[in-house]
């Protein structure tokens, strides 16, 4: 795991501690909170980023209708348990022994229970719908220009191959970005859609995770695209298991 060689920092994760103690005196970076080594050429997993965040000091195209099984992250921040690869453990518990099951993006997918709760496997989130509303502009953006710009952004900034950007829908002022990725589709080095969506979400909120890079400056044919609202829906390969009580 190496980082930028000249100044020992991690370009893709500012929530790291870096030092030239890798093999041959090379720069090595470790995530805050977990102390896990991270690969600074790619995105850090959302689990490690959430853990680092909790440890840091506090400061005519029709739009897609999310399915009834779509999850929204209403629980907010928590200090997650990550596996040795930096992925979310299927079962998460808080300090008061309240436990719940999460999907691969760390969003709760069951009712909360006690320590006896079993989460047999980490269920993969294979479809993410990013719903954006942009600020008023002189005219609507050209849809194909918007599509191309967002694909370029996800490849260059988040390293997500365009094959995983399934569609970009646009009905002014709403933009929807659909990310799709089955477990079998991921090849060596491919970024996870959950990690890309999290970096994008933080960029949109003006909380960039990148080191020393400017904030997100999104332009479509020179026209700034300023987002005023974001909603992210997560669809899992297996539907979530909530009791009827939650739905009323």
């Amino acid at each position: 795991h190496t980082a930028a060689q000249d100044n020992c920092t991690c370009p893709t994760n500012k929530m790291t501690v870096c030092s030239p103690d890798g093999p041959g005196g090379r720069c090595q970076c470790r995530a805050l909170g977990s102390g896990m080594a991270v690969d600074c050429s790619t995105l850090t997993s959302k689990c490690l980023l959430l853990k680092a965040r909790m440890s840091a000091p506090k400061n005519a195209r029709t739009l897609v209708r999310p399915s009834e099984h779509a999850l929204v992250d209403n629980d907010g921040l928590y200090d997650p348990d990550c596996d040795p690869e930096g992925r979310f453990k299927a079962r998460q518990c808080n300090q008061t022994s309240v436990c719940w099951c999460v999907n691969s993006v760390g969003v709760r997918r069951t009712d909360k229970g006690d320590l006896s709760l079993r989460c047999d496997e980490l269920v993969r989130t294979h479809h993410i719908l990013i719903d954006l509303r942009h600020r008023p502009t002189a005219g609507a953006f050209n849809h194909s220009d918007l599509d191309a710009e967002l694909r370029r952004l996800f490849r260059e900034r988040y390293r997500l191959h365009p094959k995983f950007v399934a569609a970009v829908h646009y009905e002014q002022p709403t933009i929807q970005i659909e990310l799709r990725q089955n477990t079998s589709q991921k090849a060596a080095g491919d970024v996870d859609i959950g990690d890309a969506a999290y970096y994008f979400e933080r960029d949109i909120k003006g909380e960039s995770l990148f080191q020393g890079r400017g904030g997100l400056d999104l332009r479509v044919r020179g026209e700034p695209l300023q987002v005023e609202r974001t909603l992210i829906y997560y669809l899992d390969e297996i539907p979530p298991k909530f009791s009827m009580k939650r739905l009323t």
Partner: antibody, heavy 119, light 108 residues
Framework: QVQLVQSGAEVKKPGASVKVSCKAS????????MHWVRQAPGQGLEWMGE????????SYAQKFKGRVTITRDTSTSTAYMELSSLRSEDTAVYYC????????????WGQGTLVTVSS | DIQMTQSPSSLSASVGDRVTITCRAS??????LNWYQQKPGKAPKLLIY???RLQSGVPSRFSGSGSGTDFTLTISSLQPEDFATYFC??????????FGQGTKLEIK
């Protein structure tokens, strides 16, 4: 060890098609991108296209769109590159190469297949 | 498409020399720059990926540096087997992934 073994040299007439094969071994075929790169005699390297064997996704360089088709057979761990409407300037050595999704570096290459287009 | 320009296009050097080859991208490519070595009649061989990471099995006399648009491949002490053609390649943006035109390293 990782190996990519390509089919033998081909001589084709202008307007014909050629299909080059690339058999992978020593790794899980569906876990890596496969790319095709060509090199005209005495010239540089030119990227043609890519495929993910797991789901048959392909993308091609604009220059070759409509003429090139990359396919795969997961049962034999083999990738194929077919180039149609051949012309003399397609005379080149064609390489398959295993790729990494993030760096887009090509860490293992086939030995190359010389395709000669001549009337 | 991103253009990659190598310099020089050819150079002569002696065994033991320190040699530097440069590669310039037509736009910022961060650190997504790879270097290959090719010998006559053979397939290219990956030397360095992500600007400075040495591919497994490649001798430590090869090193890479740079960021953004300007990159360098350095061979600290030339060995007889290093005389070959070297190519840079970017993997930053959407396809196509582009190569430099090559630098031929010859024996002086």
């Amino acid at each position: 060890q990782v190996q990519l073994v390509q089919s033998g040299a081909e001589v084709k007439k202008p307007g014909a098609s050629v299909k080059v094969s690339c058999k992978a071994s020593g790794y899980t075929f569906t876990s890596y991108w496969m790319h095709w790169v060509r090199q005209a005699p005495g010239q540089g390297l030119e990227w043609m296209g890519e495929i993910t064997p797991s789901d048959n996704y392909t993308s091609y360089a604009q220059k070759f769109k409509g003429r090139v088709t990359i396919t795969r057979d997961t049962s034999t761990s083999t990738a194929y590159m077919e180039l149609s409407s051949l012309r003399s300037e397609d005379t080149a050595v064609y390489y398959c190469a295993r790729g990494h999704g993030n760096y887009v570096s090509f860490d293992y290459w086939g030995q190359g297949t010389l395709v000669t287009v001549s009337s | 498409d991103i253009q990659m320009t190598q310099s020089p296009s050819s150079l002569s050097a002696s065994v033991g020399d320190r040699v530097t080859i440069t590669c310039r991208a037509s736009q910022d490519i961060s650190n997504y720059l790879n270097w290959y070595q090719q010998k006559p009649g053979k397939a290219p061989k990956l030397l360095i990926y992500y600007t400075s990471r040495l591919q497994s099995g490649v001798p430590s006399r090869f090193s890479g540096s740079g960021s953004g648009t300007d990159f360098t491949l350095t061979i600290s002490s030339l060995q007889p087997e290093d005389f070959a053609t070297y190519f840079c390649q970017q993997g930053y943006t959407l396809p196509p992934y582009t190569f430099g035109q090559g630098t031929k390293l010859e024996i002086k």
